[in-house]
């Protein structure tokens, strides 16, 4: 089995607890991989306001993950 490592995670720190739904353009979920040992939820903000990492343990992140998984499977 490949070793999981933290070094190449996309997010730094725990992430924000919530983002205003009205500000969300897109949500992307990165599952644990060889590059990063944790799930990451990346929010793309509207109006070119960049991206934010959402704390994967937050209520909002759990809802987003559930929604995406329902859509994909």
């Amino acid at each position: 089995f490949p070793m999981f490592k933290r070094g190449r995670c996309l997010c730094i720190g725990p992430g924000v607890k919530a983002v205003k739904v009205a500000d969300i353009e897109k949500a992307s979920i990165m599952y644990p991989s060889n590059n990063c040992d944790k799930i990451e939820v990346i929010i793309t903000l509207k109006e070119n306001k960049g991206q934010r990492c959402l704390n994967p343990k937050s209520k909002q992140a759990r809802l987003i993950i559930k929604k995406v998984e329902r859509k994909n499977f």
Epitope: C11, I12, G13, P14, V16, I42, I43, G50, Q51, C53
Partner: nanobody
């Protein structure tokens, strides 16, 4: 009220050392990434180093790698920047900043940070 207060700047000769401190208050320290930036006269503010208090991960700009060390004391809500082998080109006002939800891609983007200190002057003479 959120506050970031830098201290430890001063005048030092080339090759010398300084330790900067950034004392944070008014927010949950563990939720934030603390970054050090600097701005030399007539230049843009640039990222120097950052630390995530939650897991201790650290990042450095190439220009300071091997010379500067960032650390944090979570009990004191304080981040330190130990600067060794200082060069005249390190002369600048040094600022600490707090950001949340940062991506590596944007880690030294000024706009990614929510709170800023007032800065402390570092002057390195040759």
């Amino acid at each position: 009220e959120v506050q970031l207060v830098e201290s430890g700047g001063g005048l030092v000769q080339a090759g010398g050392s300084l330790r900067l401190s950034c004392a944070a208050s008014g927010f949950s320290f563990d939720d934030y990434v603390i970054g050090w930036f600097r701005q030399a006269p007539g230049k843009e503010r640039e990222g120097v180093s950052l630390i995530s208090s939650s897991d201790g991960s650290t990042y450095y700009a190439d220009s300071v790698k091997g010379r500067f060390t960032i650390s944090s004391d979570n009990a004191k809500n304080t981040v330190y920047l130990q600067m060794n082998s200082l060069k005249p080109e390190d002369t600048a006002v040094y600022y600490c900043a707090a950001g949340n939800g940062l991506l590596r891609l944007w880690m030294f983007h000024v706009s990614a940070y929510d709170y800023w200190g007032q800065g402390t002057q570092v002057t390195v003479s040759s």
